[in-house]
Amino acid sequence: IWELKKDVYVVELDWYPDAPGEMVVLTCDTPEEDGITWTLDQSSEVLGSGKTLTIQVKEFGDAGQYTCHKGGEVLSHSLLLLHKKEDGIWSTDILKDQKEPKNKTFLRCEAKNYSGRFTCWWLTTISTDLTFSVKSSRGSSDPQGVTCGAATLSAERVRGDNKEYEYSVECQEDSACPAAEESLPIEVMVDAVHKLKYENYTSSFFIRDIIKPDPPKNLQLKPLKNSRQVEVSWEYPDTWSTPHSYFSLTFCVQVQGKSKREKKDRVFTDKTSATVICRKNASISVRAQDRYYSSSWSEWASVPCS
Amino acid sequence: RNLPVATPDPGMFPCLHHSQNLLRAVSNMLQKARQTLEFYPCTSEEIDHEDITKDKTSTVEACLPLELTKNESCLNSRETSFITNGSCLASRKTSFMMALCLSSIYEDLKMYQVEFKTMNAKLLMDPKRQIFLDQNMLAVIDELMQALNFNSETVPQKSSLEEPDFYKTKIKLCILLHAFRIRAVTIDRVMSYLNAS
């Protein structure tokens, strides 16, 4: 058993049918010695008397808010949560496996640049009685500071019969140098509590591996005289690290017909312009990627040919 | 990247072309190592990230773009030693910091070259003959060093008398390649920045 926060305790249980559970001793936070009784949640049934209460915690029915009273007055509370260990592996019931980029990916994180700011998000089908708290650091043995905000509900989607909820959090490394070569990964830890169930999820990454630039901005077309060709131009996104000559991007320019089946023409360039043939009803799209370290491509920025 | 790229002309700055070749070569070598050594801990998540140049060179600090010198987090350990004279330097306008930066890059390359050559000698003794260093990568390191053209003491190749532990050598190869790739990215950024300046 360990303390998650004041008056909230997590009981770790080896979770299998007929498991013996864990013996837990609760102590009433009071100078009083006599006439103390204990109850669980909203029930008025007295579970025991005395300054301490010994319970055998086996299932969720044994978890909850234990309260000690004296003469009708509440003295203190202890909330017991359960953390299930199923065959040596901590349970992951609360969050959905996003399966990207690999199985058992519960937290996904992205950064728009090298400033040390990043966003993580996760999915769940649970809509109520759910709380999250997020901590982060650079490295784990001698951790350096990363400050995270509060997790917020960022999207709701309908998937088949189920509703899916996306939560996200923004974090910022306290003293980040965009040019630094990372040798210690960022660690992100999410505590999730659903009703009386506690779970924790972690992710470990280097900022360089989670970079996904914003799409190029100011995408424009300039027709070339007496030709079907157009000059496409664009700019670096505002959110990208500067100077751009140091933090350079490479670009992919795509000409896509109205039909998805039509052949796509693609050109790769390090410049911020390209000459392409603009077909009728086609659209031109441009996306960006770090020129020197192949992390994710940005989403496409698009303009119609007409 | 396995798709055609329209690369800009290196122009007046010959080192840019060499640094791009270097990054391509080390990235290919790392990919080959990860595929060949699939049963070894060779991914970024599995290895310890060690920097053999730590406390010996200060490339990131010495080569910091002017725009980032206002960022206190980037100024932990600016070097102040002075090494002159490299053929990549674009004439007399070259600043003190630029000379320092390029000499630091040269020292990095020299250290990695020695490590890779020592390691290759060990890998050649492996009866499994599982993996060797790409000669192209070693050649590209050499070309960039020549382009930088700094005069510095030659570091003798380390020779080891004891029987090599091939498992450990292959894990060390992965660690070295990961670190060298990261340094090659920094070198490429620096050359691109200097070329634009």
Epitope: D14, D87, N103 | -
Partner: antibody, heavy 115, light 112 residues
């Protein structure tokens, strides 16, 4: 006393269907994940499928994906395995089993796929 | 489809020490705990070892398990005639959990 009692096995022709049941007692069935495991005659153990305690997630071996469906009825304390498009290679003793460091197995039920 | 490799058979005379190996990889045994089962002919498997080296109550202490790196082993110290059975190791793979990964199985024969 934890008990898993299996039923539903038998002889079936290739291409036909069969449903296996596993009735649980002696524990809070709705709190635990459950597996199906099979063993072909003279062969080793092969995992078939898993279902979470609340039925929200199901996992299958590649060899049965798209043909077998694992389900549970927590109000009846029963686990099911619906097997469709049966093949000769599905012939085996099928076991249900609880998920956890200490596990409990059903007695097994024989499924024979033969024309 | 078996990722955990066991020897097909091992044998020993009563009183001898018999060991069975179970060889896997970094993503399964290297990352997860190992169980061992005993299966007597015509019966369901019975749990002998969980958590690499833990014995459930009721399992004789002549059975012991261990794990090192990407391999595990089961030792029977002072093998007895009633130990003649098939033995299976089981673990998980980090990419496919909660799918059970079983070893190929080992037939233990007690001679004499």
């Amino acid at each position: 006393q934890v008990q898993l009692v299996q039923s539903g096995g038998g002889v079936v022709q290739p291409g036909r269907s069969l449903r296996l049941s596993c009735a649980a007692s002696g524990f809070t069935f709705s709190s635990y994940g459950m597996h199906w495991v099979r063993q072909a005659p003279g062969k080793g153990l092969e995992w078939v499928a898993f279902i979470r305690y609340d039925g929200s997630n199901k996992y299958y071996a590649d060899s049965v994906k798209g043909r077998f469906t694992i389900s549970r009825d927590n109000s009846k304390n029963t686990l099911y395995l619906q097997m469709k498009s049966l093949r000769a290679e599905d012939t085996a003793v099928y076991y249900c089993k609880t998920h956890g460091s200490h596990d409990n197995w059903g007695q097994g039920t024989m499924v024979t796929v033969s024309s | 489809s078996y990722v955990l490799t066991q020897p097909p058979s091992v044998s020993g005379t009563p009183g001898q020490r018999v060991t069975i190996s179970c060889s896997g990889g970094r993503s399964n045994i290297g990352d997860n705990t190992v169980k061992w089962y005993q299966q007597l002919p015509g019966t369901a498997p019975k749990l002998l070892i969980y958590g690499n080296d833990q014995r459930p109550s009721g399992v004789p202490d002549r059975f012991s398990g261990s794990k090192s790196g990407t391999s595990a082993s089961l030792a029977i110290t002072g093998v007895q005639a009633e130990d003649e059975a098939d033995y299976y190791c089981q673990s998980y793979d980090r990419g496919t959990h909660p799918a059970l990964l079983f070893g190929t199985g080992t037939k233990v024969t007690v001679l004499g």
